[in-house]
Interface confidence: medium
């Protein structure tokens, strides 16, 4: 079990924060960064299913974005390897009640931060 700070949820050696507030994509990442985290990077189907299950019905930003005409990239700069479909024509990805979709960066949504768990 992950050792996570208060208000963070552990899953498979990572800690996740599910916001109550809403922000645009950029402000959401700034919040995550200030918490020694990043907008969530989804590394497996199990993780995706956990996030979809835990976040409830609201849309939540995750750490995928793309420049115009460029491939999707995670926050840390690595390219997305098409682990799951992303619907829509926006430049920033979020999780909805069915999976992943995309929207313009200035729209406001809840968000999910992720970071590695604390090894004591």
């Amino acid at each position: 079990q992950a050792a996570c700070p208060e208000s963070w949820i552990g899953f498979q050696r990572k800690c996740f924060y599910f916001s109550d507030d809403t922000k645009n994509w950029t402000s959401s990442q700034r919040f995550c960064d200030s918490q020694d985290a990043d907008l969530a990077q989804v590394e497996s189907f199990q993780e995706l299913n956990f996030l979809l299950r835990y976040k409830g019905p609201s849309d939540h930003w995750i750490g995928l974005s793309r420049e115009q005409g460029q491939p999707w990239k995670w926050i840390n700069g690595t390219e997305w390897t098409r682990q799951f479909p992303i619907l829509g024509a926006g430049e920033c990805a979020y999780l909805n009640d069915k999976g992943a979709s995309s929207a313009r960066h200035y729209t406001e949504r809840k968000w999910i931060c992720s970071k590695s768990d604390i090894h004591v």
């Epitope: 960064d33 020694d36 926050i75 700069g77 690595t78 970071k115």
Partner: antibody
């Protein structure tokens, strides 16, 4: 290994703009696992963090409240460098200015592990 | 802003002995604390980050401890090159990083 090389004038007139540049070798200014900071040091104020820029799919800037209205930190990806601009300087801005690199290892920040050589800036007419 | 207070301002210790430097934060910074060593005319050098992790190339006679608001840097078996000024710095979640005023470690 990562190295930072600073350049810029050592004397700035009051009310003018202080401009310093920090050239990065051994890393990229748009690295997803670093933040690039400016720090200054003076006998009266000690070590003072001024601000930072970093890239996480988009560029972010954060500034200290004491200089927020006067400061700009800008990355230049084509030259792999970042710069500091401090407007409307006064003699209180006289200090040694350092550029620094902060690691972000697996989302967690560490300390300021790489420093430039420092630039002594005097604000005087 | 978080205020960092270091004590003592000056510490006199003999070579070969142990030095203990303290740093206190005005509010919790979790383990987001670093220690630096600075010698005259040089940039500060990172010794410890995350309150207790040694930076690359730092000898194991340097160790850090603490979390929340109270932190300690311990230097065992002091070598002549260890006499310098030491600073603590918080890099907690406010993103407004602040340094302590420094402790000068001098030869007794």
């Amino acid at each position: 290994q990562v190295q930072l090389q600073q350049s810029g004038p050592g004397l700035v007139r009051p009310s003018q703009t202080l401009s310093l540049t920090c050239v990065i070798s051994g890393d990229s200014v748009s690295s997803g696992s670093a933040a690039w900071n400016w720090i200054r040091q003076s006998p009266s104020r000690g070590l003072e963090w001024l601000g930072r820029t970093y890239y996480r799919a988009k560029w972010y800037n954060e500034y200290a409240g004491s200089v927020k209205s006067r400061i700009t930190i800008s990355p230049d990806t084509s030259k792999n460098q970042f710069s500091l601009q401090l407007n409307s300087v006064t003699p209180e801005d006289t200090a040694v200015y350092f550029c620094t690199r902060q690691d972000k290892d697996n989302t967690r920040y560490s300390g300021l592990g790489v420093w430039g050589q420092g630039t002594t800036v005097t604000v005087s007419s | 802003d978080v205020v960092m207070t270091q004590s003592p301002a000056t510490l006199s210790v003999s070579p070969g002995e142990r030095a203990t430097l303290s740093c206190r934060a005005s509010q919790s910074v979790s383990s987001n604390l670093a220690w630096y060593q600075q010698k005259p005319g040089q940039a500060p050098r990172l010794l410890i980050y995350g309150a207790s992790s040694r930076a690359t190339g730092i000898p194991d006679r340097f160790s850090g401890s603490g979390s929340g608001t109270d932190f300690t840097l311990t230097i065992n078996r002091l070598e002549p090159e260890d006499f310098a000024v030491y600073y603590c710095q918080q890099y907690g979640s406010s993103s407004m990083y602040t340094f302590g005023q420094g402790t000068k470690l001098e030869i007794k």
